[in-house]
């Protein structure tokens, strides 16, 4: 399938001009290669009319140009002084020959309709209203006023000043005068449909002295706006229907032959195909709203329509806006797993892609909620503290960088199952959706911490050990101290790594962390995890409580496992009280409904990352003179 996209059908009238925009994939080669516009002949040959190499055919001389806009990945063909001879089949394309990548465009140029001279032509969109102005001479002021619509032979009454109204205009047409002006009457017709288009005659008075005015009403379907999006990216349909429908229910539907199937509306309807990846957001009191769809699939391509009606369904004679969505399969967004599976009590590490050109953008993770219009409350972000109910079990690591950050969620329950979004305050196309499935655990977890009821005594030494299976032998093990700004990696000691790599004793694979001396600030959540380079794997969490020594007793670590733990060698120590920038309030609330939720993250000002990002191991460090790790507070 060609990745070039443009308008399928373009129509105009003689003497007018057209502007045709064609889209191409965002690559350096495409930006620089030849762009062309050619006309298809009966033989299948496509004859170049204009190209970006400077070629201009004789029939286009002085009336056409082709402009490349590499920054938008589009090129535009402008053609003026159209004649009916321009009607035909064309291609816009890329490549050194006209057999390159292309898109078929049909151009239809029709004759200017012959109208009686001095006809007033009104052009309005479907669903809107028009006020036809009917001037008359003062002497006809007392006479009957009327508006009729011309049919083949006669003129069928629409409305008159005696309050006669054609049945198909009842509730839609009204005839009135304004103020003291006795030389014009007006007819307003609302909820315009295609059937209302045509010639009308206004009349004041009867017989030869009557005043008549010819009116041509053109009712147009809105031109579809072209949207060119990459596979797996996201799209926002911005719908602006005007104040007159501000209080009506809104919808977005997709054309399916003759009908338009509702995908989502503000009355709670949602197509199951879009579960977890769609939001509808009322913008303001002026009838504006937007629909955001993430994780675009190739089958999402098509013709979309938004509208407003109390039923939340498409209705003739109500305003609409339309789009043609093209999903480019040559996507720059990496193909990641869209479903992540975890087990109760276990953990998941989710790799979130972002535009690699925007490494300093703020990263977020939100949970899609389908109630109401759908929203996505932020659970964690580079400068957004972790939501309280996720305390101790959620962290965002702004690594490995170069296009990926990691979100880790542990202590999983079946309630965690659902849809989550990765998003940044940068390029909004890179919003991605992950479905998390959580099954009941059927075996012991891979990582186990001892002691499990961890209570450390103030001023003493306390060691916790994390047991891991042999399959994690070659992976890097780490301990980190969790805070609502991230999980800061601590120095730890891997006991298993001392063994010969030939055999692996399942019972002695452990990584230990020692607190010496224990201080009150050491209380909190700690994670033990594994990773391979910057790819994070499983984690498990433990809460360490700190209490004062009871008089007359000395504290002994409660398990044999801790007795096996060797003290860590002297090494650089990470201070657990890394200074962080204050959490910034996130502006512009919306689909992400409370003050911690984000709407147009793409519109937010770019902010640099906090110096101590979640998951970063570089905080303020100091070395220790002891053989155990000290946390200096």
């Amino acid at each position: 399938k060609s990745p070039i996209f443009g308008p399928q059908e373009v129509s105009s009238i003689e003497g007018d001009s057209v502007s045709i925009t064609c889209y191409y994939p965002d690559t350096s080669v495409n930006r620089h290669t030849r762009k062309y516009w050619c006309r298809q002949g009966a033989s299948g040959m496509c004859t170049t009319l204009i190209s970006s190499n400077g070629y201009l055919s004789k029939e286009y001389s002085g009336r056409a140009n082709l402009i490349n806009f590499p920054e938008n990945n589009t090129f535009v063909i402008n053609i003026e002084q159209l004649t009916q001879d321009d009607t035909g089949s064309y291609k816009c394309g890329l490549g050194t020959s006209n057999r390159g990548l292309s898109f078929d465009v049909s151009l239809e140029v029709s004759q200017v309709p012959e109208l009686p001279s001095d006809t007033h032509v009104y052009t309005k969109d479907i669903g809107r209203n028009v006020t036809i102005e009917c001037p008359f001479k003062r002497e006809n002021a007392p006479s009957k006023k009327s508006l009729c619509k011309k049919t083949n032979q006669s003129c069928e009454l629409v409305i008159d000043s005696t309050e006669k109204v054609n049945p198909s205009y009842i509730g839609r047409a009204k005839l009135f005068m304004k103020g003291t002006d006795l030389t014009v009457f007006y007819v307003n017709i609302s909820h315009l449909t295609h059937n209302d288009a045509g010639l009308y005659i206004c009349q004041a008075g009867e017989g030869p002295s009557a005043d008549k005015k010819n009116v041509d009403l053109q009712v147009l379907a809105p031109e579809p706006e072209l949207l060119y999006k990459d596979l797996r990216s996201s799209v926002t349909f911005e719908c602006d229907l005007g104040r007159e429908v501000a209080n009506e229910a809104k919808y977005l539907c997709r054309m399916n032959k003759e009908t338009c199937d509702v995908i989502i509306n503000t009355l709670g309807k949602r197509d199951p195909d879009f579960e977890g990846r769609i939001l509808i957001t009322p913008k303001d009191d002026n009838g504006r709203f937007s629909v955001l769809i993430t994780g675009l699939r190739k089958e999402d391509a098509g013709h979309y329509q938004c509208g407003a009606h109390s039923s939340g369904l498409p209705q003739e004679g109500w305003p609409i806006q339309t789009w043609q969505l093209f999903v480019n399969e040559e996507s720059t967004i990496p193909n990641r797993r869209s479903v992540v599976k975890g087990v109760t009590g276990g953990s998941v590490a989710i790799a979130c892609p972002y535009n690699p050109k925007e490494s300093s953008s703020l990263k977020y993770w939100c949970r899609w909620e389908g109630d109401g219009n759908g929203h996505c409350p932020v659970l964690v972000g580079t400068q957004a503290q972790v939501q309280e109910e996720y305390e101790g079990r959620l962290a965002l690591f702004d690594q490995p960088g170069n296009g990926t950050y990691t979100v880790i969620l542990n202590q999983l329950t079946t309630e965690d199952a659902g849809f989550y979004w990765c998003l940044t305050n940068g390029d909004s196309r890179w919003r991605t959706t992950i479905e998390l499935q959580v099954a009941e655990a059927t075996r012991e977890p891979n990582l186990e911490v001892t002691p499990q009821n961890a209570t450390a005594v103030l001023g003493e030494t306390f060691t916790v050990s994390c047991h891991y299976p042999c399959k994690f032998y070659s992976q890097e093990k780490y301990w980190c101290k969790w805070s609502n700004k991230g999980c800061h990696i601590l120095p730890s000691h891997d006991e298993g790594a001392r063994q010969s790599s030939v055999s692996c004793d399942q019972s002695s694979q452990l990584v230990s962390m020692t607190l010496n001396p224990v201080s009150k600030e050491d209380e909190g959540w700690y994670w033990c995890g594994v990773k391979q380079g910057q790819t994070y794997g499983e984690t498990t969490a433990i809460y360490i409580a700190v209490e004062e020594r009871t008089r007359g007793s000395s504290h002994v670590n409660p398990t044999d496992a801790n007795a096996r733990a060797k003290v860590a060698l002297e090494e650089e120590v990470v201070d657990s009280s890394i200074s962080e920038k204050e959490n910034k309030a996130i502006p512009n609330p919306g689909p992400f409904a409370n003050e911690r939720e984000i709407q147009n993250v793409g519109d937010q000002a770019q902010e640099n990352r906090a110096s101590g990002d979640a998951g970063s191991a570089d905080g303020q460090s100091r070395s220790s003179s002891s053989k155990h790790h000290h946390h200096h507070h």
């Epitope: 109208l115 001095d118 006809t119 007033h120 032509v121 009104y122 052009t123 028009v130 006020t131 102005e133 001037p135 304004k178 014009v184 007006y186 307003n188």
Partner: nanobody, 120 residues
Framework: QVQLVESGGGLVQAGDSLALSCAGS????????MGWFRQAPGKEREFVAD????????GYADSVKGRFTISRDNAKNMVTLRMNSLKPEDTAVYYC?????????????WGQGTQVTVSS
Amino acid sequence: QVQLVESGGGLVQAGDSLALSCAGSGDTFSNYAMGWFRQAPGKEREFVADISWYGANIGYADSVKGRFTISRDNAKNMVTLRMNSLKPEDTAVYYCAADRNHWPVKGDYWGQGTQVTVSS
């Protein structure tokens, strides 16, 4: 046919107001739907606002909705564009246009233009 002359342009500060007028002569003014268009340096001419023959239908560009108001007085052969809360991006030459047969206005007849400059 109608001849059009614009007036009222000038240099103002951002946030200020200005009113442009367009006087028509040479034909019955109510025979024409009227409009305002503008052209900023290096840009295409763009639609601003228009009004039908007797003022019952009015249209505005999204960029000026709520800030600009168009009105007409057929007795005085005049169309006026009141511009409030002006922004630097409103800087342009403003043209008055008339159309005998069409609303929205396409622009069969044009004035010479009046310069509006909005400084920040």
